[in-house]
């Protein structure tokens, strides 16, 4: 791989543009932060491949590593990649932002780690401090990576001075995990039970031959002990299981169940906990809100989603105008209820290519023997507006009228406008709005009708023009929440013997 400029470190000016080129014997690609930025790839006549990455309007946030690598590493040195580090000194950017994974540094052993506070300018002096501490710590700094060393369990910040301003980084939290050689897992047949039902928990340890289990649970605190059963899972090497079974649970059995496992040879121990909830009776609870008025657009698909919690598992029914809905054979309606966690459900009604007739009152009912919940909403089908007719006439009264008729849902608004200078309007001059009460030369009369069967509004608007002294382009625009439509007509004065 050949990279130009070769680097390995470049310092570029803020706001500038810079071009990086990489070429190789197989397809190559530039990578930045594990992604491929937009770049131009090409193959030359001599069979070499290249990729050109153009960095435009550079800011401090462009500071970082850039890699060129083979796009398809089959049959090639798989790990051949060229690294380039670019600095873009930018006084407006202090420390480069970190994501949460970089701010919290977890260790399982005493080992060297890096606190990844990085700046945009390699000339800046950066110091490391304990959070809320003034004393700089004697730890080596690499402008491309950060501070590397062996750190205690503390929180740390980096400091630098940009111009005359002292800048602090986010705090970095170093935490040493207490890792034991015992690997414990706890699970329950179910974490929510009704009183009278059974609670069954299992605690499994892997990789130990002799261990001691100790359970703590709400019943134990009141002195009512339950004897766990310990067995070996014979199909797996050194898998030991302890089962805690509480028949006929009571409300007081709700709480945290902890399995503590100790192994005395090396004095290792581990524990895991799980929460169990005992409910007096089953429940169904809606989560979140669904508005009482929902919208769908004609001929588009629409999914209506209800999220709820329930135990035990409920039956879910959907109704439209009090009639039960089912998956239609024509594929116009799809119903699904998914169990997304132990007690959480998502029920979806999908209307495929919505029709006017699908407007109406919808209800979802979720129920079991102990409880039920229902959620209702009105579904309105929105129909894009369209102008059906635009006509001009001149009755005997001497005035001229233009009639515009259109339909849509929700109710369309009508806007009348006119161009008096046909050469320059509307390209150079904006059209004049008509029909305002202040305008004496035009009057407007608008009627709205709701057509029940088609479930849409019809708007008929008549514009009366008092005296037209030269040709006029009159435009009728209808607009609603899902669209707009326009038609125009040329109105000529009575005296002119022709129409354009």
């Amino acid at each position: 791989l050949v990279v130009t400029p070769p680097g390995p470190e470049l310092v570029l000016n803020v706001s500038s543009t810079f071009v990086l080129t990489c070429s190789g014997s197989a397809p190559v690609v530039w990578e930045r932060m594990s992604q491929e930025p937009p770049q131009e790839m090409a193959k030359a006549q001599d069979g070499t491949f290249s990729s050109v990455l153009t960095l435009t309007n550079l800011t401090g946030l462009d500071t970082g590593e850039y890699f060129c690598t083979h796009n398809d590493s089959r049959g090639l040195e798989t790990d051949e990649r060229k690294r380039l580090y670019i600095f873009v000194p930018d006084p407006t950017v202090g420390f480069l932002p970190n994501d949460a994974e970089e701010l919290f540094i977890f260790l399982t052993e005493i080992t060297e780690i890096t606190i990844p506070c990085r700046v945009t300018d390699p000339q800046l002096v950066v110091t490391l401090h304990e959070k809320k501490g003034d004393v700089a710590l004697p730890v080596p700094y690499d402008h491309q990576r950060g501070f590397s060393g062996i750190f205690e369990d503390r929180s740390y910040i980096c400091k630098t001075t940009i111009g005359d301003r002292e800048v602090d980084s986010d705090a970095y939290y170093v935490y040493r995990l207490q890792v034991s050689s015992i690997n414990v897992s706890v699970n329950a047949v179910q974490t929510v039970v009704r009183q009278g039902e059974n609670i069954t928990l299992m605690c499994i340890v892997i990789g130990n031959e002799v261990v001691n289990f100790e359970w703590t649970y709400p019943r134990k605190e009141s002195g009512r002990l339950v004897e766990p059963v310990t067995d070996f899972l014979l199909d797996m090497p050194y898998h030991i299981r302890s089962i805690l079974h509480i028949p006929s649970a009571e409300l007081e059995d709700s709480g945290t169940y902890t399995c503590n496992v100790t192994e005395s040879v090396n004095d290792h121990q581990d524990e895991k906990a799980i929460n169990i909830t005992v409910v007096e009776s089953g429940y169904v609870r809606l989560l979140g809100e669904v508005g009482t008025l929902q919208f769908a657009e004609l001929h588009r698909s629409r999914t209506l989603q209800v999220v709820f919690e329930a135990y035990p598992p409920p039956t879910v029914l959907w109704f439209k105008d009090n009639r039960t809905l089912g998956d239609s054979s024509a594929g116009e309606i799809a119903l699904s209820t998914r169990n997304v966690s132990e007690t959480r459900y998502v029920s979806e009604l999908t209307l495929v290519r919505v029709k006017v007739a699908e407007a109406g009152h919808y209800t979802m009912r979720a129920f079991h023997e102990d409880a039920e919940v229902q959620l209702s909403f009105q579904l309105q089908i929105n129909v894009p507006v369209r102008v059906l007719e635009l006509s001009e006439s001149h009755p005997d009264s001497g005035e001229q009228t233009v009639r515009c008729r259109g339909r849509g849902m929700p109710q369309p608004n009508i806007i009348w406008s006119a161009c008096r200078d046909l050469k320059r309007c509307p390209r150079e001059l904006p059209p004049t709005l008509l029909g305002n009460s202040s305008e004496e030369e035009s009057q407007l009369e608008t009627n709205v009708t709701y057509w029940e069967e088609e479930q849409e509004f019809e708007v008929v608007s008549t514009l009366r023009l008092q005296h037209v002294d030269r040709p006029l382009s009159v435009r009728c625009t209808l607009r609603n929440a899902v669209g707009q439509d326009t038609q125009e007509v040329i109105v000529v004065p009575h005296s002119l013997p022709f129409k354009v």
């Epitope: 932002p97 949460a100 994974e101 701010l103 919290f104 986010d170 939290y173 995990l177």
Partner: antibody, heavy 127, light 107 residues
């Protein structure tokens, strides 16, 4: 300087609505969980709600579920609390706080407390 | 929900005294407990997290201990700046609960 500044409090009638804002500065807002905590006059602290870094996970105390809603705008480094159907018992000083919840470690969550707090904004619900 | 109970509610002490505040959880919370200090008209300040880890910048006279359901905050030698209200707070699957508070006042 790491700072949180709340605003939007005021006097509102029972059943009314209010939106509280919290402006963050001096840290990478988008990398932290954030919480709202309230304190009724002369009373102790009550945690109200929190939200993860990208807004995909929220949690509420039972007494406010369905009435109060937490949201955030990472681009504007702001946290919000949308308050509806307000009751007299919602009268309190509302604090926003940075919640130090690291990313999950295997099957374990760690927690380092609420280390940065705003000065608070007062909400009074009264007719 | 997990309830947190602090005792005592009020504590009268003198400068130099050793002060201990107790916090009890209604069920085991391992060591997911934090302690805060609050002065009148001010925001709370984090003192200790994970039951015993001192927050940066907090004087070493403050210490925390305990696990499971019983926790204590100790001030080894009370200073004039320490007269305030102290709250414990549990963390469990992202929900939080504070204790009702312990006011440390001048004897």
């Amino acid at each position: 300087e790491v700072q949180l500044v709340e605003s939007g409090g005021g006097l509102v009638q029972p059943g009314g609505s209010l939106r509280l804002s919290c402006a963050a500065s001096g840290f990478t807002f988008s990398s932290y969980w954030m919480s709202w905590v309230r304190q009724a006059p002369g009373k102790g602290l009550e945690w109200v709600a929190n939200m993860n870094q990208d807004g995909s996970e929220t949690h509420y105390v039972d007494s406010v579920k369905g009435r109060l809603s937490i949201s955030r705008d990472n681009a504007k480094k702001s946290l919000f609390l949308h308050m509806n159907s307000l009751r007299a018992e919602d009268t309190a000083v509302y604090f926003c706080a940075r919640d130090l919840v690291p990313p999950r470690q295997d099957d374990y969550y760690y927690y380092f407390g609420m280390d940065v707090w705003g000065h608070g904004t007062t909400v009074t619900v009264s007719s | 929900d997990i309830q947190m109970t602090q005792s005592p509610s009020t504590l009268s002490a003198s400068v130099g005294d050793r002060v201990t505040i107790t916090c009890r959880a209604s069920q085991s919370i391992s060591d997911w407990l934090a302690w805060y200090q609050q002065k009148p008209g001010k925001a709370p300040k984090l003192l200790i997290f994970k039951a015993s880890t001192l927050e940066s910048g907090v004087p070493s006279r403050f210490s925390g201990s305990g696990s499971g359901t019983e926790f204590t905050l100790t001030i080894s030698s009370l200073q004039p700046d320490d007269f305030a209200t102290y709250y414990c707070q549990q963390y469990n699957s992202y929900s939080r609960t504070f204790g009702q508070g312990t006011k440390v006042e001048i004897k």
